[in-house]
Interface confidence: low
Amino acid sequence: VTGSRVYPANEVTLLDSRSVQGELGWIASPLEGGWEEVSIMDEKNTPIRTYQVCNVMEPSQNNWLRTDWITREGAQRVYIEIKFTLRDCNSLPGVMGTCKETFNLYYYESDNDKERFIRENQFVKIDTIAADESFTQVDIGDRIMKLNTEIRDVGPLSKKGFYLAFQDVGACIALVSVRVFYKKCPLTVRNLAQFPDTITGADTSSLVEVRGSCVNNSEEKDVPKMYCGADGEWLVPIGNCLCNAGHEERSGECQACKIGYYKALSTDATCAKCPPHSYSVWEGATSCTCDRGFFRADNDAASMPCTRPPSAPLNLISNVNETSVNLEWSSPQNTGGRQDISYNVVCKKCGAGDPSKCRPCGSGVHYTPQQNGLKTTKVSITDLLAHTNYTFEIWAVNGVSKYNPNPDQSVSVTVTTNQAAPSSIALVQAKEVTRYSVALAWLEPDRPNGVILEYEVKYYEKDQNERSYRIVRTAARNTDIKGLNPLTSYVFHVRARTAAGYGDFSEPLEVTTNTVPSRIIGDGANST
């Protein structure tokens, strides 16, 4: 039965003579006259089992003391700590040269835990032990004892266990404590990696490389390794683990971020408070949820505040210049907390009679500098149709506008472009040709660009080649040209006029009047 004594964490005790209750019962040779088990009292009046020998008067002493079998427990090297008191030979009266101030320490490896006798030739010498000059004075009961402590090591060991032996060659000595232990590097956590109990190597300079395992809720950054030194101390840690997302290092552990905090990545940073306009409702959050009406763009870092779409632009002003419109506006009152605001222009062409019937303007309209993604608060729109109702919407957008289910970030203005000269008339037809007259009809211009006030028909005899022409004006899209010469080729041009002026003449229509009183009906541009 052994009592509990406290030793360094890196030492595993295999034998401690001071922890044994009752007699030690080690084997001595000779059985009498050599080593003797004696109980003395320590400072707490507790008995200590010691072995003493003081055969200093007789020469050629050879007294052996052997321990019980000691299990190796996987250790390749063990340490023997001996606390002893040894008297100076000079302090012993009448002792001649036979007195010694040393004793010898031996060991013998064996798989047999029941060997009854000491066979000296089986034992291997570890060292000769002498009293150190520096000793600890310990109060043992009513006496001050000069207590020396010596530690030796032995290895590599390979059998299941071993015996220790002490050889006295003529000293006056008391073994107060014998402790046998091996060294381990104790379980430890360094840089969030746990390193297991590791028995030291076989020799005093060996290093045992040990790979650590990351503590719960952490992952390797660099492979965590340490070396277990022969003295049972961990040497130079390499690599480390990092707390997983949603966890931070606290007291050497990776603990979940508290509610209201988060950590997005596996780093050595601590959990951060949720950014503005966001929250976390569980421990271990890797990101925070945006408040209602607030959003986070795809490329927004988890550390950025949640933001919302901007409000509508303000103070939209339009300036119409013929078929161009310049629009200018002010930034929204609320940018949603973002810097990436831009503007999109939506152009709609609306009917004069029913302004609600609008349709997109199409690709013919041009925007300067651009239609979408405007960074400035003005735009110039050109190539519009004249005398047309347009509605322009200016949309304020930012990185989270696309997440908004109820957009209300636009301001609009409706304008009518100025009248302009009409386009040319595409088709002029001779509907009826007689000897003295031609009945003409035509279509309205593709782009009237305003209210058509009248049409102007210019005609001349072909061989006169426009040196002498006549003009007829009409509000209708047809007219009868009378007073022509029979059997004569005439060229006709038609153009339209709005308040803004005349358009271009149509392509020439060539018609030849008849020689007989009959009528000729023609649709072609060059009736003959």
């Epitope: 840089n191 005093t204 101390e233 961990w234 050497g252």
Partner: antibody
Framework: QVQLLQSGAEVKKPGASVKVPCKAS????????MSWVRQAPGQGLEWMGW????????TYAQGFTGRFVFSLDTSVSTAYLQISSLKAEDTAVYYC??????????????WGQGTLVTVSS | EIVLTQSPATLSVSPGERATLSCRAS??????LAWYQQKPGQAPRLLIY???TRATGIPDRFSASGSGTDFTLTISRVEPEDFAVYYC????????FGQGTKVEIK
């Protein structure tokens, strides 16, 4: 007792080399790493790196690669710092220090007395 | 690399007074921090390792605390032999020293 003994002051010309020894005694030389620390005149301490006395494997701090070499002679329990192509800005006291690593933390628990290297033309 | 910033640069105290020195890391070094004392013309001396563990032979008037990024060295009652420069040093990632705090007689 445990101690580290360094050589006396050195005066070198720019471009020359210097080899600073650090002899250990009083403990098992190969049980502790050896660190090197620089201190320019009137300045603070700068960690240069360390060498594993078991394997001879050196680790250099930023700014101390190339011209600086750590080496060992375990038979005489001595670590060396060699600096080549010396520059005026290498003028400093160079310390060796034993690295003690325990369960509770690391520290340089035993220091040499330092070697002053002066680089001057 | 991790930068250690010590404050104040100079601390003036009278013998018997309490001295508090600060060391702040640019990122967490856990408890991987040591404190050293250096007197003029001498090599540095290890005072504290593991952020708070006194080295062998260091008087108990020296104490230290902190972890992560903020660390403190306290001398409870300054003795005449304590006037020196004090350095913090981290070994969490590579090794670096602070720029030092000089403790001088007031």
């Amino acid at each position: 007792q445990v101690q580290l003994l360094q050589s006396g002051a050195e005066v070198k010309k720019p471009g020359a080399s210097v080899k600073v020894p650090c002899k250990a005694s009083g403990y098992t030389f190969t049980s502790y790493a050896m660190s090197w620390v620089r201190q320019a005149p009137g300045q603070g301490l700068e960690w240069m790196g360390w060498i594993n006395t078991n394997t001879g494997n050196p680790t250099y701090a930023q700014g101390f690669t190339g011209r600086f070499v750590f080496s060992l002679d375990t038979s005489v329990s001595t670590a060396y710092l060699q600096i080549s192509s010396l520059k005026a800005e290498d003028t400093a006291v160079y310390y060796c220090a034993r690295v003690r690593t325990t369960v509770y933390g690391d520290g340089m628990d035993v220091w040499g007395q330092g070697t002053l290297v002066t680089v001057s033309s | 690399e991790i930068v250690l910033t010590q404050s104040p640069a100079t601390l003036s105290v009278s013998p018997g007074e309490r001295a508090t020195l600060s060391c702040r890391a640019s990122q967490s070094v856990s408890s991987n921090l040591a404190w050293y004392q250096q007197k003029p013309g001498q090599a540095p001396r290890l005072l504290i390792y593991g952020a708070s563990t006194r080295a062998t032979g260091i008087p108990d008037r020296f104490s230290a605390s902190g972890s992560g990024t903020d660390f403190t060295l306290t001398i409870s009652r300054v003795e005449p032999e304590d006037f020196a420069v004090y350095y913090c040093q981290q070994y969490g990632s590579s090794w670096t020293f602070g720029q030092g705090t000089k403790v001088e007689i007031k």
